[in-house]
């Protein structure tokens, strides 16, 4: 299910992309699921659709619940689903785990904090940055574009960080907070040539014709953050964004994952409804970073349905 | 390969390398040099499915490799060249399965094209 989870406070902004995606000349119908009534696109609305995106200026709690987005095309439809959460303010500093974003890790080389999903917003520099509820003040704090530098990092900076801007729509200005973790790693990094733990090289896949099957590409590129490393699927050595099959879509997994101190990443090749013609394809799990590429090739094979014992 | 030549340092040249007789769809094609008393070594790669560029860290910022698929072809723009860029420079392919500035990846070798930069 093409899912996502959008969280926001009372009295903000925010603005929410529709999870599936398409070209943009595609017209994007937004429904409210619960009673399949649908989303206006007139700006006058406190809540309205814009092409792929879905606008709560400002968000109120009771706009919590799930959103459909129909992606038409001439060809096909591709349904969407956006859990969005608004949540009353905090009257403390303590940002609780439910609103925050996905933590960073730094080290004295990277030390970037990327303010979450701040280029779905109309928003002009500078940002203003806090931690723990604190403004950021001091020459070693630099609010660069979407993201704060810190300077020569030490373990006291680890912290949550929100960022805090001005979402402009039509002349009237909206604010938005976003709030992530920064753990500062202290071991030295190295960066190796991706090593691909799933899928083994050549492995055939045993698919069922009809039903879904997903494909996982894992690779590992070395310890400590990465600068440059990234996963992707290939169809017959094609993109799958250039190969033109609706029902064939990747996905991002898990985004960094320090498991052991190793930085890997996943991305998830889901195949919707499978059909024969699918068997016939080469799908490439490639990972590649600034020492080179691998590539690990798979197939799919047609599973002989289990027989019913009755 | 053809383009090599000979160039004043600060000058540019354009290397190409025509391939065949190989699957050129999902391969690895190189340029790798090999000066008088030296190793041959990496100097960039590209992944003909997608394009994404590997470099070695002498010419990253100088050297540009890029692809014509539709004529089976790789290029390496060289610019700002200095005297120690002067060497034979060959073209490789390799079957894909590995995309780096590495010889073992490559098992297609080109005859090679001199090229000289003089100070």
């Known amino acids: 299910k093409f899912s996502k989870q959008s969280w926001g406070l009372e009295n903000e902004a925010l603005i929410v992309r529709c999870p599936r995606q398409g070209k943009p000349s595609y017209t994007v119908d937004w429904y409210y699921s619960q009673t399949n009534k649908s989303i206006p696109t007139q700006e006058r609305n406190r809540v309205f659709a814009s092409g792929q995106l879905l606008k709560f200026l400002p968000a109120a709690v009771a706009d919590s619940g799930i959103y459909t987005c129909i992606v038409r095309s001439p060809t096909f439809n591709r349904t969407g689903y956006a859990n969005v959460t608004i949540y009353k303010k905090q009257s403390d500093c303590n940002v609780p785990d439910y609103l925050m974003y996905s933590t960073v890790s730094g080290s004295e080389k990277n030390s970037k904090i990327y303010c979450p999903t701040i280029d779905l917003y109309n928003w002009t520099a500078p940002l203003e940055w806090f931690k723990n509820c604190q403004a950021l003040q001091g020459s070693r704090y630099r609010a660069h574009k979407s993201f704060l530098v810190i300077d020569n990092v030490m373990t006291e900076d680890a912290g949550d960080y929100t960022c805090k801007f001005i979402h402009n729509e039509n002349g009237a200005n909206y604010s938005v907070t976003a709030t992530r973790s920064f753990t500062v790693k202290d071991e030295q990094g190295f960066s190796l040539f991706p090593v691909i733990g799933a899928p083994a090289q050549n492995e055939i896949k045993e698919v069922e014709i009809g039903k879904n099957a997903n494909l996982t590409c894992s690779a590992c590129f070395g310890k400590g953050t990465q600068f440059l490393a990234a996963v992707l699927w290939q169809l017959n050595g094609t993109k799958i964004t250039d190969f033109g099959e609706p029902r064939i879509q990747q996905e991002e997994g898990q985004n960094q994952s320090f498991s052991n101190g190793l930085a890997c990443l996943d991305m998830v090749l889901r195949i919707a409804d499978v059909k024969e013609e699918d068997l016939l394809l080469q799908y490439d799990c490639l990972a590649l970073n600034l020492h080179g590429l691998r590539r690990h090739t798979v197939r799919l094979s047609r599973k002989n349905p289990s027989k019913e014992c009755f | 390969e053809s383009g090599g030549g000979s160039v004043q340092a600060g000058g540019s040249l354009r290397l190409s390398c025509a391939a065949s007789?190989?699957?050129?769809?999902?391969?690895?094609m190189g340029w790798f040099r090999q000066a008088p008393g030296k190793e041959r070594e990496g100097v960039a790669a590209i992944y003909t499915s997608g394009g994404m560029t590997f470099y070695d860290a002498s010419v990253r910022g100088r050297f540009t490799i890029s692809q014509d698929n539709a004529k089976n072809t790789v290029y390496l723009q060289m610019n700002s060249l200095k005297p120690e860029d002067t060497a034979t420079y060959y073209c490789?392919?390799?079957?894909?399965?590995?995309?780096?500035?590495?010889?073992?990846?490559?098992?297609?070798w080109g005859q090679g094209t001199q090229v000289t930069v003089s100070s």
């Open positions: 007789g190989f699957t050129y769809r999902r391969a690895c």
């Open positions: 490789a392919a390799g079957g894909g399965d590995y995309c780096a500035t590495n010889a073992r990846f490559f098992n297609y």
